[in-house]
Amino acid sequence: GELETSDVVTVVLGQDAKLPCFYRGDSGEQVGQVAWARADAGEGAQELALLHSKYGLHVSPAYEGRVEQPPPPRNPLDGSVLLRNAVQADEGEYECRVSTFPAGSFQARLRLRVLVPPLPSLNPGPALEEGQGLTLAASCTAEGSPAPSVTWDTEVKGTTSSRSFKHSRSAAVTSEFHLVPSRSMNGQPLTCVVSHPGLLQDQRITHILHVSFLAEASVRGLEDQNLWHVGREGAMLKCLSEGQPPPSYNWTRLDGPLPSGVRVDGDTLGFPPLTTEHSGIYVCHVSNEFSSRDSQVTVDVLDPQEDSGKQVDLVSAS
C-alpha cells in the first residue's frame, strides 16, 4: 500500500484546511491509527491529533477545538483531518503517520500554505493644480501573503512606481500614480486594482481626480456694438470662465461705482434702459481657491442725437 496526500494544501486565512492522508491499501488491509504532527524543520514534531480505530480522535491541547474529522463520507482508510479557522501561524510542514495491519507504518508530508488576502487602502496625493509638474495623484497599499499585485486602471496618462516591504509572514506593496495635472483630467476615475490568489476577484478602489484650475476670463455681450444705444432694454454683459472648484464672479466699474439700476446676477451684469451714463469700463473679476482672473471691457452707449459712432475696447488681464 501507499499514502496519498497533497504536496501543498492552500487555504485562505480563516477557512478550514483539509489535510489529506489516505492509505491506498490492498484488499483486507486496515488502518489502526493515524497520527498528525507539525513537522517544521528546527521546531521538532508537535502533535496535532491521533485518530485511532478503537479510541477515536484525540486532539492535542494546543489544537483543542480546532482539529476535526471532515464531514462524511469517511473511508476507513482515510486519515484526513480538518484544521479549522486557519491562521498564518499554521503555515508550514505537516506529517501524517499511518499504522496499518498487516502492512505496517507509512508516513507522508505536506505543506500548508495560508493565503492572507489583502485589505487595500488608497490615499490621494496632495491637491492637484493645473500648471504643476509631475505630481503624486494617489498611492495604493496592500499587504498580504503572498505579496499582492497592485496595478492601476485609468484612461489618464501617468506613470507608476511600486515598492514592497517584506515582513516575517507577509509583504506590503505600495504603488504610486504620478501625473502632470491638466483640466481634462477632472472627474476622471483612477482605480487601484489589487490581485491576490486569496481573492475570488480583484479588489478595486476608485478615486475621482480633482484638478484645480481657472480658465482665462472673457466678456460676452458687446459683439454687436450697434445694439448699445440710448433707450435699449435688456442689455447685458456675461463673464465667461470655468474652473475647479467652480469660480465666483464679481462685477465692478473701473471709473466709478456701478450705475443705479445695474444688476449683478452671478456672472451676468444686467442693465436698465441704456443711457449715456452707462458708458464706462466694466471689470469682471473671476476667482476660486486656486487663482483669480480679470477681464475688462469698455462700454460706449451711442446717443443717436449725437452723430458719433460707438467704440468698444476689450481688454483682458490676469
Partner: antibody
C-alpha cells in the same frame, strides 16, 4: 465497560421543552462524533442530530431544525439534546449513539429514554 | 436527502435458513452503508459498516455486499437469536438516513 446512558425523558405538553442528557463512560466522549436517533412507538429509526468531536460542526434533520439543539460538555463526558416547541410527532424513544472514528457508523448505543408529548 | 428502501419489510424464515435483505439507495452512496440489528425493547446493534466490513464481535454468518445504490445483508444460517428487525443506514452524507426496517420472524 464502554457505555452510554440517556436521561431526561418524560411527559411534556405540546409546545413544551425538555433537555435530554447522555453520559458516556469507559471512553472519552470528546474523541468521537456523537449522534441522537429516535424511534416512535412501533416505527423505524430516525436520525435526529449529530455533533463533531470538537463541537465545531452540528447537523440536524429537517423535522427538528430550529427547535432542537445538540451540544456537548467534554469535561463532563456528556452529550445533550435541548428540545423546544415539542409536538406530538416528537414522541419517541431517544437514543444517543457514538460515531466510529474511521467510518461514522454508530458503534455504541445507549438504552434510550422515552419522550412523550401529549396534552 | 438520500432515501433508503428495504425489501422485504417482513420475512418469515426458519432456523438454518439463508436469509437475504436488500437495501436500495435513491442515489449513489459508494460503500457508505451500515447494517443494524434491533430486538424489541433494546437499542440497535451495529453489524456491518462500509457495506461489507463485519463489526468486531459479530458472528461471521452475517455478511454484507454491494456498492452504489444496491446493497444486501445476508445471514448464511439463521439462528434463534437472529430473529429481530434489521435496518440499513447511509453514512455517505448528512442527513444520515435509515431504511424502514425488515422484520425477520419465525416461520
Amino acid at each position: 465497560e464502554v457505555q452510554l446512558v440517556e436521561s431526561g425523558g418524560g411527559l411534556v405538553k405540546p409546545g413544551g421543552s425538555l433537555r435530554l442528557s447522555c453520559a458516556a463512560s469507559g471512553f472519552n466522549l470528546n474523541h468521537y462524533n456523537m449522534n441522537w436517533v429516535r424511534q416512535a412507538p412501533g416505527k423505524g429509526l430516525e436520525w435526529v442530530s449529530s455533533v463533531s468531536s470538537g463541537g465545531g460542526f452540528r447537523y440536524y434533520a429537517d423535522s427538528v431544525r430550529g427547535r432542537f439543539t445538540i451540544s456537548r460538555d467534554n469535561a463532563k463526558n456528556s452529550l445533550y439534546l435541548q428540545m423546544n416547541s415539542l409536538r406530538a410527532e416528537d414522541t419517541a424513544v431517544y437514543y444517543c449513539a457514538r460515531g466510529a472514528v474511521f467510518h461514522d457508523a454508530f458503534d455504541i448505543w445507549g438504552q434510550g429514554t422515552l419522550v412523550t408529548v401529549s396534552s | 436527502d438520500i432515501q433508503l428502501t428495504q425489501s422485504p419489510s417482513f420475512l418469515s424464515a426458519s432456523v438454518g435458513d439463508r436469509v437475504t435483505i436488500t437495501c436500495r439507495a435513491s442515489q449513489d452512496i459508494s460503500s457508505y452503508l451500515a447494517w443494524y440489528q434491533q430486538k424489541p425493547g433494546k437499542a440497535p446493534k451495529l453489524l456491518i459498516y462500509v457495506a461489507s466490513t463485519l463489526q468486531s464481535g459479530v458472528p461471521s454468518r452475517f455478511s454484507g455486499s454491494g456498492s452504489g445504490t444496491e446493497f444486501t445483508l445476508t445471514i448464511s444460517s439463521l439462528q434463534p437469536e437472529d430473529f429481530a428487525t434489521y435496518y440499513c443506514q447511509q453514512i455517505n452524507s448528512y442527513p444520515f438516513t435509515f431504511g424502514q426496517g425488515t422484520k425477520v420472524e419465525i416461520k
